[in-house]
Amino acid sequence: SPVPPSTALKELIEELVNITQNQKAPLCNGSMVWSINLTAGVYCAALESLINVSGCSAIEKTQRMLNGFCPHKVSAGQFSSLRVRDTKIEVAQFVKDLLVHLKKLFREGQFN
């Protein structure tokens, strides 16, 4: 049966918490990704940014989970209107910013 949206969001938060907790060496070898506006459409925008990181097992589960939240197909090289123009940040910072935002969504009961 389908997972309730609140449970799905909690599981995504859980995964991001695991990533931040278990981070020893630089996450994804310090790879840089496009920063995004943390507004509407955050899941697709986050996926569009992170999908460009390859060969990083630490975020593969996150990529799969975000795929479940995003209603359309996302492929590498896609550019979202939510991308912050010409701003790249490390994956570790991206994950932290996303985690803060998703925890607020959970606190506010915004699951979709």
């Epitope: 609140s6 943390l38 803060v100 607020k104 009961g109 699951f111």
Partner: antibody, heavy 125, light 112 residues
Framework: QVQLVQSGAEVKKPGSSVKVSCKAS????????MHWVRQAPGQGLEWMGT????????KYVPKFQGRVTITADESTSTAYMELSSLRSEDTAVYYC??????????????????WGQGTLVTVSS | DIVMTQSPLSLPVTPGEPASISCRSS???????????LEWYLQKPGQSPRLLIY???DRFSGVPDRFSGSGSGTDFTLKISRVEADDVGIYYC?????????FGQGTKLEIK
């Protein structure tokens, strides 16, 4: 260390406005919610509203709607509460407080864990 | 708005004795995300309030284990196992589940 430092006491005339500031240090305000709570002399605590400084979204108590404006300036790590059309019943100590997430827990408290020292606003003709 | 009703309003206690404060909400305060954002704050004379308990029963860091919270639905309790002179002040319950968030009217704990 975490600190919330509020602006000084104010004396205002009925019908005027007051703007109280709350300067944060030791954390990023965009990671938090910033709240405003007031306490009339000899009375209990009353939550007025909150802001998410990351996007400017606010929530207000209906009784203050239209009279209160909560804002935040990420660049100066400062939250503000402006109350207009002041009346004598608005005489109170106004507190700012933060609630923040925690890196290492899935289910965060987001309770008001740090408070400012309070700002006394006196409304008198 | 949800009304939070505390009892008693005044609580004289002998040092070393237990104390209990009740807080009743006018409706269920389970948040849509499944959490119950019921908190307890202590305001000592001349000071700003400080957080004691969050989410019904979780003690905030630095709060002595003499303090405990319990309850569910609409009925909540703060217990102090052995009151100390330093515990004097006004105790407030607070619900952060449904906007507008609301405080109880406060319970004044004093030493006999």
């Amino acid at each position: 260390q975490v600190q919330l430092v509020q602006s000084g006491a104010e004396v205002k005339k009925p019908g005027s406005s007051v703007k109280v500031s709350c300067k944060a240090s030791g954390f990023y305000i965009k990671d938090t919610y910033m709240h405003w709570v007031r306490q009339a002399p000899g009375q209990g605590l009353e939550w007025m509203g909150t802001i998410d400084p990351a996007n400017g979204n606010t929530k207000y108590v209906p009784k203050f709607q239209g009279r209160v404006t909560i804002t935040a300036d990420e660049s100066t790590s400062t939250a503000y509460m402006e109350l207009s059309s002041l009346r004598s019943e608005d005489t109170a100590v106004y507190y700012c407080a933060r609630s923040i997430y925690d890196d290492y827990h899935v289910d965060d408290y987001y309770a008001m864990d740090y408070w400012g020292q309070g700002t006394l606003v006196t409304v008198s003709s | 708005d949800i009304v939070m009703t505390q009892s008693p309003l005044s609580l004289p206690v002998t040092p070393g004795e237990p104390a209990s404060i009740s807080c009743r909400s006018s409706q269920n305060i389970v948040h849509i995300n499944g959490n119950t954002y019921l908190e307890w704050y202590l305001q000592k004379p001349g000071q700003s309030p400080r957080l004691l308990i969050y989410k019904i029963s979780d003690r905030f860091s630095g709060v002595p284990d003499r303090f405990s919270g319990s309850g569910s639905g609409t009925d909540f309790t703060l217990k102090i196992s052995r009151v100390e002179a330093d515990d004097v002040g006004i105790y407030y319950c607070f619900q952060g589940s449904h906007v507008p968030w609301t405080f109880g009217q406060g319970t004044k704990l004093e030493i006999k």
